[in-house]
């Protein structure tokens, strides 16, 4: 196997590799630095393996996966001692590396010249006490949201930031605004930002307006 790659968004984590097998199967093992290897996706002919259940046990650990190739009568795929060939993945630390999924604006509410914009706190597959944690539960204050907003009638964007899931911004009375948010983890060196949320504009169904 080669080109072992971690594909991970909001902790949903899949290991992918190449090539499509001919006359052999794959088994994947995953471990933290403890070296307690756990086998997954036994004797599969797929070229991907969902490792979410393992990495969510402790998202701050660093994981390594290895893909073993088991030949069907193909001696060249074993080492000299007859053990199966394997390849290691890159190291993967979910907390530092999982991609931030596209956020969603849950609602916005205008009261006079103030608008409160709320970002949906997405549920992850990370569990604590048999409950699925939200993105905010997992990242705490490491996670911020950036709000981009502009008057429907112009293109000049303003920004606001929050380390909660809510923004309270000043707007001009009588003007309609559009909003988009982005999740950011400023302390990261990779995968710092999500893609922007879908744009939501005042005057559409997600808004509430009070004088």
């Amino acid at each position: 196997a080669f080109n072992l790659t971690w594909i991970s968004t909001d902790f949903k984590t899949i290991l992918e590799w190449q090539p499509k097998p001919t006359n052999y199967t794959y088994t994947v093992q995953i471990s933290t630095k403890s070296g307690d290897w756990k086998s997954k996706c036994f004797y599969t002919t797929d070229t991907e393996c969902d490792l979410t259940d393992e990495i969510v046990k402790d998202v701050k650990q660093t994981y390594l996966a290895r893909v073993f190739s088991y030949p069907a009568g193909n001696v060249e795929s074993t080492g000299s001692a007859g053990e199966p060939l394997y390849e290691n993945s890159p190291e993967f630390t979910p907390y530092l590396e999982t991609n931030l999924g596209q956020p969603t604006i849950q609602s916005f509410e205008q009261v006079g010249t103030k608008v409160n914009v709320t970002v949906e706190d997405e549920r992850t597959l990370v569990r604590r006490n048999n409950t699925f944690l939200s993105l905010r539960d997992v990242f705490g204050k490491d996670l911020i949201y950036t709000l981009y907003y502009w008057k429907s009638s112009s293109s000049g964007k303003k920004t606001a930031k929050t380390n909660t899931n809510e923004f309270l911004i000043d707007v001009d009375k009588g003007e309609n605004y559009c909003f988009s948010v982005q999740a950011v983890i400023p302390s990261r060196t990779v995968n710092r930002k999500s893609t922007d949320s879908p744009v939501e504009c005042m005057g559409q169904e997600k808004g509430e307006f009070r004088e």
Partner: antibody, heavy 118, light 107 residues
Framework: EVQLLESGGGLVQPGGSLRLSCAAS????????MSWVRQAPGKGLEWVSS????????YYTDSVKGRFTISRDNSKNTLYLQMNSLRAEDTAVYYC???????????WGQGTLVTVSS | DIQMTQSPPSLSASAGDRVTITCRAS??????LAWYQQKPEKAPKSLIY???SLQSGVPSRFSGSGSGTDFTLTISSLQPEDFATYYC?????????FGQGTKLEIK
């Protein structure tokens, strides 16, 4: 800072026993596999044994299988090597090392000398 | 067992020199190779793992390369503190094995 401190070395007669200890600090001990490596006087390095973080998996070089036992006590942050039926060729400095994934050796202790002689 | 052969066994060089040490495995080990430095009467120190990944805190003048059976450790510009013995180690399969060492001496 990672610190590994070996103890328990000394002079022992052929056929005798010795138990080496390695006290670990500066990291979460149970999160790492650990290893013992030895070096005979004036010679190169020789891997002896490794153990996974849980203690469930152990590995040995052929020359010590059945004579040496690696173990760990995660509540005490301590690694052990029980050495029985010692031979003159086991004379060496024994190093304890942290071993991410049970692979390479990223931090080493200062070593303890075991001398097997009559 | 996988045999690891280092060359040369010893090497004389001067501060500022570029030095290369090679390590050959008796069978393919992919990139599962580490390099260590050892000074007299001291414990070894980890330099490189996964053939080319620099251990944290190790100066960037050290680099590793190779895959399969042939590997090299390069010191781009020798410093006085680099004179020591260097070992490679395979961790492809048990029993893990080391090269016999390369002693780097001052010319």
């Amino acid at each position: 800072e990672v610190q590994l401190l070996e103890s328990g070395g000394g002079l022992v007669q052929p056929g005798g026993s010795l138990r080496l200890s390695c006290a670990a600090s500066g990291f979460t001990f149970s999160n790492y596999a650990m290893s013992w490596v030895r070096q005979a006087p004036g010679k190169g390095l020789e891997w002896v044994s490794s153990i996974s973080g849980s203690g469930d998996y152990t590995y040995y070089t052929d020359s010590v299988k059945g004579r040496f036992t690696i173990s760990r006590d995660n509540s005490k942050n301590t690694l052990y090597l029980q050495m029985n039926s010692l031979r003159a060729e086991d004379t060496a400095v024994y190093y304890c090392a942290r071993s991410p994934w049970g692979y390479y050796l990223d931090s080493w202790g200062q070593g303890t000398l075991v001398t097997v002689s009559s | 067992d996988i045999q690891m052969t280092q060359s040369p066994p010893s090497l004389s060089a001067s501060a500022g020199d570029r030095v290369t040490i090679t390590c050959r495995a008796s069978q393919g080990i992919s990139s599962r190779l580490a390099w260590y430095q050892q000074k007299p009467e001291k414990a070894p120190k980890s330099l490189i793992y996964a053939a080319s990944s620099l251990q944290s805190g190790v100066p960037s003048r050290f680099s590793g390369s190779g895959s399969g059976t042939d590997f090299t450790l390069t010191i781009s510009s020798l410093q006085p503190e680099d004179f020591a013995t260097y070992y490679c180690q395979q961790y492809n399969s048990y029993p893990y094995t080391f090269g016999q060492g390369t002693k780097l001496e001052i010319k």
